[in-house]
């Protein structure tokens, strides 16, 4: 969490941002809140990016002002216009690119004063893994697949019964570049699995950590998966 305060002249206002991560090829949100004002027409929101000449986005007098927007953000940004009045200056970013990573500044002017806060935005790719029994294999085998990751993640297998066991010798992981030549498909195979056990396939890079669990019994197969973004810090 980053909390920024205004500078000289008028009173300062508190602006708060949260470091976040964007998933390449999806929409992302850059979070920013501020002390609200009574009149929408008195609020100015400017989003800037370090190293970029033009603005990322500007909102003033109740509407978007695009004349100074940088080429790399054209047609890809919007604020939540109906929430600005309650102090939400968060930016919606369409079709996140790898190059969108960097330091952003959320700069606010209201009738109460000015304020700004920086935000670190990471970009990469992350997706939920799915673990299945590989019936084509000669022995009892599990196959963990996740369609989109970047940077290249690590893949670790674990089991409920053999806690702390190292499965690197009985697993094989491959990374296949996707068609856009950035993200990769992750496939990991675990051999010699035993029945009545829960196995977990854990995929992690510096942006996200995802886990796919599978419980195989004689009568049924249960699956569960979850994904967690790393390093979400508020400012």
């Amino acid at each position: 969490l980053i909390i920024g305060f205004g500078i000289s002249g008028r009173h300062s206002i508190t602006v708060t941002t949260v470091a976040s991560a964007g998933n390449i090829g999806e929409d992302g949100i850059l979070s920013c809140t501020f002390e609200p004002d009574i009149k929408l027409s008195d609020i100015v929101i400017q989003w800037l990016k370090e190293g970029v000449l033009g603005l990322v986005h500007e909102f003033k007098e109740g509407k978007d002002e695009l004349s100074e927007q940088d080429e790399m953000f054209r047609g890809r940004t919007a604020v939540f216009a109906d929430q600005v009045i309650v102090g939400n200056a968060s930016l919606r970013l369409k079709n996140v690119q790898l190059t969108d990573a960097g330091t952003y500044k959320c700069y606010i002017i209201t009738s109460k004063g000015k304020g700004n806060a920086n935000l670190e935005y990471k970009t990469g790719a992350f997706s939920m893994p799915e673990v299945n029994v590989d019936y084509n294999a000669s022995s009892e085998t599990l196959r963990c697949e996740a369609p989109r990751w970047f940077p290249q993640p690590t893949v670790v297998w674990a089991s409920q019964v053999d806690q702390g066991a190292n499965f690197s010798e009985v697993s094989n992981t491959s990374f296949e570049l996707n068609s856009e030549n950035v993200t990769m498909k992750v496939v990991s195979v675990l051999y010699n699995v035993t029945i009545n056990n829960t196995y977990s396939c854990m995929i992690e890079n510096d942006i996200a950590k995802a886990t796919g669990d599978i419980k195989v019994t004689e009568s049924e197969i249960k699956r569960r998966s979850h994904l967690q973004l790393l390093n979400s810090k508020a400012s």
Partner: antibody, heavy 120, light 107 residues
Amino acid sequence: EVQLVESGGGLVQPGGSLRLSCAASGFTFSNYYMSWVRQAPGKGLEWVAYVSSGGGSTYYSDSVKGRFTISRDNAKNTLYLQMSSLRAEDTAVYYCTRESYSQGNYFDYWGQGTTVTVSS
Amino acid sequence: EIVMTQSPATLSLSPGERATLSCRASQSISDYLHWYQQKPGQSPRLLIKFASQSISGIPARFSGSGSGTDFTLTISSLEPEDFAVYYCQNGHSFSLTFGQGTKLEIK
């Protein structure tokens, strides 16, 4: 050659449901945002919804929000529009469209359209 | 929501004449304005992107101009195949809106 072929249109009663499909070929489907745009008889064009290239992000026009669901299957190169709680005003030709690659929100390719008629 | 207004609703001209179609946005959209042509029984096709950028395969007689709220599509010398309906589209943000269209008909 880029091709978008819609299917699934037809006659449905008010309050009913329908699922439209769009089969894409001639380009790397998983790299592009896709949208549905509709056109009521004798009327203009209305953007309905988009889905991101990976399928994780969607956005809808106010007129269909909460009733329609856009989705995609990149393994099958297919775009979908699940329509429920249909109303007479949803009667239109529905076009599957490809959005420009990285920016600008314009539609560079369109399908031939599939007709949805909502009537009792 | 940004409202796009096209004028005139109908434009009657003869082949060889110059056509000027207008589109106005309810708020400034910089140059995030795109034009489409739709012939009867056909799907729309992209003519111009970002107010003035030409599209591969589109004849040079089609040109666009404008920025902010006011935009113009010009057809320098009308060919018989140009008689159709033309739509402008706001490409600025997430909610993408079209104008109601201008029908270009033979006089």
